[in-house]
């Protein structure tokens, strides 16, 4: 059956808005002509003032934030959960790959420890680090490691003679390191490795972040007054005629809809375009594309470059003994 | 070859030697945040349509509100939905999105190009640089075992994939996600008491 | 699924004040309406008073008006009840209750209530 | 000020019978505003009908709600021993601005 008829005193508009604005006496007696008001444009006499028109204007926008952020609860949550998840899972990774390093090398090369588990820690922390988007070179991570590690190497294990902390000795063999390419091409290959897994894996982390964002800011945005006054048309503009529980028409609500949201279905083309894109990352995402194969194998491949080390091992000494003598015999005298 | 390290960990279930079935990978994590994600693809698209189903518009009713007054549902005046005096929509999708939607969209292209940037082409997961460097030995790669250790022996295959879930406080089932809508069948007369926003029939 | 969870009895001497606690879980609760009722012991149902969360506004009714405090904390997702000035009429048990909303707009129904605080 | 009178007080029947509760407002209250609520023993309320009519979810088909103006009534077509508890109407919308009725057990 259709409604009442307004109610002839504005008593019970009165009573709806005086939830949302207590105590203030807003709400006209009796109908009034309403010739001020600029939204709610009455046909006949009405129970709303401007003032309450403003209070509508307001509680429409945030009545349409609601909407907005539970509209994208679920997608929201889906990320935030799986970024966390993904981040922790990561850093998971890297604690055992630094574990496996580390029992590596007290297994096979027990001399070599405790300095060997300050470099693999140091090595490893900046993983973690440029994981989370840090400006680190990971090149420049490689190139240190094993150049912390070769003058331990030489002298731990090549050299045993040569009396320990000799630092001019220390950086005469870092540079040997790279000039006689002591540990033959594996520090390139674990650059390219570990360059290409922690890239893809720091981009796939960055995009989960920004998605995140993305809904954050559709979640928060602040719509435009023209909005503002076609969401109250529809939604309150039947309160001033004692209205309360009729409802727009279905049409009438899509055509406001995509009128406010015009802007922010804009970013649908995008949107779009990030999910495919993150899935061709994620479908690429293995063999050395893949952080967690790439760095749970590192400790072999260092293992396999120390082993290079010790078969070149006669040749290296003598060719060093030469290259770094100046060192050795300052340190000597 | 590398002595296997064993005796440092507590988690040495994690380096499982046989393949066990349906074991959650990060991988498979990936491509079921991917798949998930694929079923939000038309969110922006679908939002105008989506905040109308879910406030409160006439469905049932035979009167509806057309911004002005109260009409038939399906009358001229329904379609016509009042405004025609009052805003000039074309004029209002005319103005573009607002600066932070115009920023987000920036962010989202540059992302999109970094993702595509880094996007491994099909069939070139390997540099033949890397090939001819040894990195793949040849007898280790069935299934996502590999092999991790030089050749020679003692060897070991290890599962590829950790099964760090177990080790994740987190339980991603999205059905239990705060939020998730009930979709019921409203029958006619009925409320679904649900916590969409405007939880009238 | 919304659901209120109050918290515990009380025992208080006349002319002190009690402050109830109504922590709701599910849905968004800023978009709720929250209603205080009280029901005294073999009696009916008395509103007390209500808030809407994302407005921080509050009615009361007349009965309790100046002896009634209610608020919500949106970050924990919980109302309260503050009556002072107790006297032994307001032995009760005192229930919180969603109402149902268009808008934000409480139309006045209460569909999920708490257990009551004694 | 807007009082809900209830009847009868108590009504006692059996198992299969039709019962029928009564609620009068002082002032004409709109059928949208008017709301019935059944509450047993050591429990809260539950809201079984609004808008005068209409039944919320989960509530047997037995239980209907019809009315408008200053009269309206609560019928349980045929009684379950479960529907043993007492009912209240509430209106909402006239100073104070929820009034509850007095009850029927």
């Known amino acids: 059956q259709p409604p009442p008829p307004p109610d002839a005193t504005c008593h019970q508009v009165r009573s709806f808005f005086q939830r949302l604005q207590p105590g203030l006496k807003w709400v006209p007696e009796t109908p009034v002509p309403g010739s001020d008001l600029q939204v709610c444009l009455p046909k006949g006499p009405t129970c709303c003032s401007r003032k309450m028109e403003e209070k509508y204007q307001l509680t429409a926008r945030l009545n349409m934030e609601q909407l907005l952020q539970s509209a994208s609860m679920e997608l929201k949550f889906l990320i935030i959960q799986n970024a966390a998840v993904f981040q922790e899972a990561f850093e998971i990774v890297v604690r055992h790959a630094k574990n496996y390093t580390n029992a590596m090398f007290k297994n096979n090369y027990p001399s070599l420890t405790p300095q060997a588990f300050e470099f693999v820690g140091e090595f490893f922390t900046d993983v973690s680090l440029y994981i989370l988007g840090s400006d680190i070179n990971v090149d420049d991570m490689v190139n240190e490691l094993f150049d912390s590690l070769f003058p331990v190497i030489y002298t731990q294990m090549m050299n045993p003679g040569l009396p320990e902390s000799v630092l001019d000795i220390n950086e005469c063999l870092r540079g040997a390191r790279r000039d006689l390419k002591v540990f033959g091409s594996f520090p390139k290959l674990i650059m390219t490795q570990v360059s290409k897994s922690l890239q893809v894996t720091r981009i796939f982390l960055q995009a989960l972040n920004l998605g995140i964002e993305v809904i954050n800011t559709t979640d928060h945005l602040k719509f435009s007054k023209d909005c503002g006054r076609m969401l109250t048309r529809m939604w309150y503009c039947s309160y001033c005629q004692g209205l309360m529980m009729v409802k727009p028409c279905g049409g009438y609500c899509n055509v406001v809809m995509q009128g406010c949201m015009a802007g922010v279905v804009e970013i649908d083309k995008y949107w779009r375009e990030y999910i495919l894109s993150l899935e061709e990352l994620v479908n690429g995402m293995y063999r050395i594309y893949d952080m967690e194969n790439v760095l749970l194998g590192l400790f072999s491949t260092i293992h396999d470059s120390i082993q290079y080390v010790q078969k070149n091992g006669g040749k290296l000494t003598t060719t060093i003994g030469k290259l770094c003598a100046h060192s050795q015999q300052r340190q000597y005298r | 070859s590398a002595y296997y390290p064993e005796d440092l960990f507590i988690d040495k279930k994690i380096l499982k030697v046989a393949h066990v079935e349906h074991e959650e990978t990060l991988s498979s994590r990936r491509r079921e945040l991917i798949q998930k994600l694929k079923s939000f693809i038309n969110f922006y698209s679908a939002l105008p349509g989506y905040i109308c189903s879910h406030s409160p518009v006439a469905e049932n009713d035979t009167l509806c509100w057309n911004g002005q007054e109260l009409v038939e549902r399906y009358s001229q005046k329904a379609a016509r939905n009042g405004m025609k005096n009052q805003f000039n929509l074309h004029e209002l999708k005319m103005k573009g999105p607002e600066p932070v939607v115009s920023q987000i969209i920036d962010k989202l292209k540059h992302i999109n190009q970094l993702l595509r940037t880094m996007s491994v082409p099909k069939g070139k997961v390997l540099d033949k640089s890397l090939d001819e460097e040894g990195l793949e030995s040849g007898d280790c790669g069935d299934d996502e075992d590999e092999c991790i250790g030089s050749s020679g022996d003692g060897m070991v295959k290890v599962k590829n994939q950790l099964r760090f879930l177990a080790e994740l406080a987190y339980d991603l089932d999205v059905d239990d996600a705060p939020g998730n809508k009930q979709h019921g069948n409203q029958k006619d007369n009925e409320i679904t008491t649900s916590h969409s926003v405007g939880n009238m029939p | 699924e919304v659901q209120l969870v109050q918290s515990g009895a009380e025992v208080k001497k006349p002319g002190s004040s009690v402050k109830v606690s109504c922590k709701a879980s599910?849905?968004?609760?800023?978009?709720?309406?929250i209603s205080w009722v009280r029901q005294a012991p073999g009696q009916g149902l008395e509103w007390m008073g209500g808030i809407i969360p994302i407005f921080g506004t509050a009615n009361y009714a007349q009965k309790f008006q100046g002896r009634v405090t209610i608020t919500a904390d949106k970050s924990t997702s919980t109302a309260y009840m503050e009556l002072s000035s107790l006297r032994s009429e307001d032995t009760a048990v005192y229930y919180c209750a969603r109402e149902w909303q268009q808008q934000l707009v409480p139309l006045g129904y209460m569909d999920v209530w708490g257990k009551g605080t004694t | 000020e807007t009082t809900l009178t209830q009847s009868p007080g108590t009504l006692s029947l059996s198992p299969g019978e039709r019962a029928t509760l009564s609620c009068r407002a002082s002032h004409s209250v709109s059928s949208n505003f008017l709301a019935w609520y059944q509450q047993k023993p050591g429990q809260a309320p539950r809201l079984l009908i609004y808008?005068?009519?209409s039944r919320t979810t989960g509530v047997p088909d037995r239980f209907s709600g019809s009315g408008s103006g200053t009269d309206f009534t609560l019928t349980i077509s045929r009684l379950e021993p479960e529907d043993s508890a007492v009912y209240y109407c509430?209106?909402?919308?006239?100073?104070?601005?929820?009034?509850f009725g007095q009850g029927t057990k």
């Open positions: 599910g849905g968004t609760f800023s978009s709720y309406a």
């Open positions: 808008a005068a009519s």
């Open positions: 509430q209106q909402y919308g006239y100073s104070p601005l929820y009034t």
